[in-house]
Interface confidence: low
């Protein structure tokens, strides 16, 4: 139904408090650049404004759509150019075109400092002050750092946060209660960034039907009792919440959310009987349950897909009447047989069986064309368990940080363009990703790799499209989302690549490496193996070995030595001459 | 198509400068890191400078540094390569590549420092 003022229908159907930390996140996820305080300073005129709209709908302005009314507060900041430069041209736009300008100007890799988390002490003492004034400070950090988080998630991460702080200031040992609680919230929320840039980046570069597609898969999985209509009932209502969210529409987002979650909970008996745990908890925590639901279990006596999809008379009609209908519901009835495959992995079987029907069903004998079509998709499903299987035997004979230097390796030789720190930083994810998952049961361990590694390359591609250096990388980025993961894994020796001029300065080091912590001591010996690549890419696995091992002595000795940096200044150019000579 | 045609080489005495320039068409130049690579007769290609796409961002050898400046005029599209106090070991033809990819250079253009 249509609403006299949409900002005060928002405030109404949210609540003052998860109205101001949505508006809030909307201004820290589109002016990255300024202090908390005017932030707060704005938070509370729209806050006001909202409260005015409730009072009387028909008062001035308060008609305006709201990413209308946020455009309008953005452009009266005074020093908006002095501290956004061009994204003031923005406000010599008109709405829709205005909105679209703010969202191209969201940087995904702002230059902030991580966000350090203060002493236990300092934390309580602070929270103990104020905690809305806290938490909206936690809000603020997050959001400034990770420009399409998910807003209602946030919200229900700052309420863990909340929770965690007011249990464990009270506590003996805050830090040992506080550590591991804050921790989880980290890790988890660091996933939840990653997964929602995904989503906006496949409704952004690849449009609906990817994005639906993929929730198709998702969805089907979770819930393989509920029918296929009412699968898609979700996946529109889905897509609706996550345009709004990618979009900067946080309110509608949020409200539209709740909304979901409330059909999902009123039709539970047809979807799910996991749902029942999720129904009975407060908004937040309700959305968030059936967000990270365990997934059902299969129903009993699900016919062969073969019947369907191939023995069928009517498989080409079907295709030909109704082509999205028909390969949903293939996507649909195979994802609900396969939870242990990746979403990739389900949307490249159902896109290569298209890519089967389009042929065959031109062809005078249709059926004889694609009888073999499930024969010809295997590859799909062994490709990826190969490369799982190979790649966690790897894991488990190097441990992490060997693993991450293979891939270290492994990846400069494919795009060797790629900065340094940016080909380190995705090195150590990548390998990370054999922790996360490699020690899981076979049946978890290929979705658990592939779902994490499109997500690290989801984050490779948009920092790369920012400033593009490798075409290789650029065409595995954007000709096809689901190939992404097969794109790179396909690439090997950039045989184009001109190797870099050996600079003694990438292997020179000082005594200050001996006392850093061991996390930052990997990371400057990464930095110095991938330059070695890009110096030598065609460098043997022998003469990596050998160089590596040459380094590891070298930095043990002069660690150990009493007077370290006469040792690093003496054996340095040493280790150097005799790198050369081993890669020459 | 992707094209990228080089000029302002030439003879120059050591010690002179010269401005390569590389016209740049058929792709989003803005997008695109570019650099300079030269090759020197009968020798492998070798690196010599880098830019971001924005230009904000470069990058240039040992043997180059203090003396070339590469920039780009991103309305033109086009980059350039600024040489002065040039030495005979700075002969070779100086290609114009997208990233550091010589799969993706223009014809080259001749350099020559001799007095």
């Known amino acids: 139904e249509a609403h006299k003022s949409e900002i005060a229908h928002r405030f109404n159907d949210l609540g003052e408090g998860h109205f101001k930390g949505l508006v809030l996140i909307t201004l820290s996820q589109h002016l990255q650049k300024s202090p908390f305080e005017e932030h707060v300073k704005l938070v509370n005129e729209v806050t006001d404004f909202a409260k005015a709209c409730v009072a009387d709908e028909s008062a001035q302005n308060c008609g305006k759509a709201i990413a209308t009314l946020f455009g309008d507060k953005v452009c009266a900041i005074p020093s908006l150019r002095e501290t956004y430069g061009e994204l003031a041209d923005c406000c010599a736009k008109e709405d829709p075109d205005r909105v679209e300008c703010f969202l191209q100007h969201k940087d995904d890799n702002p230059n902030l400092p991580p966000f350090e988390r203060p002493e236990p002490e300092a934390l309580c003492t602070a929270f103990k002050e104020n905690n809305d004034r806290f938490i909206g400070h936690y809000l603020y950090e997050v959001s400034r750092r990770h420009p399409y988080f998910y807003a209602p998630e946030l919200l229900y991460y700052a309420e863990k946060y909340k929770n965690a702080l007011t249990e464990c200031c009270e506590a003996a040992d805050k830090a040992a209660c506080l550590t591991p609680k804050l921790d989880a919230i980290k890790e988890k929320a660091l996933v939840s960034s990653a997964q929602q840039r995904l989503k906006c980046a496949s409704l952004q570069k690849f449009g609906e039907r990817a994005f639906k597609a993929w929730s198709v898969a998702r969805l089907s999985q979770k819930f393989p009792k509920a029918e296929f209509a009412e699968i898609s009932t979700i996946v529109t209502s889905l897509t609706k919440v996550t345009k709004e969210c990618c979009h900067g529409d946080l309110l509608e987002c949020a409200d539209d959310r709740q909304e979901l979650a409330k059909y999902m909970c009123e039709h539970q008996d047809s979807i799910s009987s996991k749902l029942k745990e999720c129904c009975v908890k407060p908004t937040l925590q309700k959305a968030h349950c059936i967000l990270e639901i365990q997934r059902d279990e299969l129903p009993t006596e699900l016919p062969d897909l073969a019947v369907d999809f191939v023995e069928d008379k009517e498989v080409c009609k079907n295709f030909a009447e109704a082509k999205d209908v028909f390969l949903g519901t293939f996507l649909y009835e195979y994802s609900r047989r396969h939870p242990e495959y990746s979403i990739g992995m389900l949307l490249r079987i159902a896109k290569g069986y298209e890519a089967k029907l389009e042929k065959c069903c031109a062809e005078a004998d249709p059926h004889a064309c694609y009888a073999k079509v499930f024969d010809e998709l295997q590859p799909l499903i062994d490709e990826p368990k190969k490369l799982v299987q190979q790649n966690c035997e790897l894991f488990d004979k190097l441990g992490e940080y060997g693993f991450q230097n293979a891939l270290a390796v492994r990846y400069t030789q494919k795009a060797p363009q790629v900065s340094t720190p940016t080909l380190v930083e995705y090195a150590r994810k990548l390998g990370s990703v054999g922790t996360k998952c490699c020690s899981l049961p076979e049946t978890e361990r290929l979705s658990c790799t592939e779902n994490y590694l499109a997500l690290i390359l989801n984050r490779l591609c948009i920092l790369h499209e920012k400033t593009p250096v490798s075409e290789r990388v650029t065409k595995c980025c954007t000709e096809s989302l689901v190939n992404r993961r097969p794109c790179f894994s396909a690439l090997h020796v950039d045989e184009t690549y001109v190797p870099k001029p050996f600079h003694a300065d990438s292997f020179t080091f000082h005594a200050d490496i001996c006392t850093l912590p061991e996390k930052e001591k990997q990371v400057k010996k990464q930095m110095a193996l991938v330059e070695l690549v890009k110096h030598k890419p065609k460098a043997s696995e022998e003469q990596m070995k050998t160089v590596m091992g040459d380094f590891a002595a070298f930095l043990k000795k002069c660690c150990d030595a009493d007077n370290k940096e006469a040792c690093f200044t003496e054996d340095g150019p040493k280790l150097v001459a005799k790198c050369q000579a081993t890669l020459a | 198509d992707v094209q990228l045609v080089e000029s302002g080489g030439g003879v120059v005495q050591p010690g002179g400068s010269l401005r390569l320039s590389c016209a740049a068409s058929?792709?989003?130049?803005?997008?695109?890191?570019m650099s300079w690579v030269r090759q020197a007769p009968g020798k492998g290609p070798e690196w010599v400078s880098s830019?971001?796409?924005?230009?904000?961002?470069?990058l240039y050898a040992d043997s180059v540094k203090g003396r070339f400046t590469i920039s780009r005029d991103n309305s033109k599209n086009t980059l350039y390569l600024q040489m002065n106090s040039l030495r005979p070991e700075d002969t070779a033809t100086y290609y114009c590549?997208?990233?550091?990819?010589?799969?993706?250079s223009g014809q080259g253009t001749l350099v020559t420092v001799s007095s």
């Open positions: 830019i971001s796409g924005s230009g904000s961002d470069t």
């Open positions: 058929g792709f989003t130049f803005t997008s695109f890191g």
């Open positions: 590549t997208i990233g550091g990819s010589l799969s993706r």
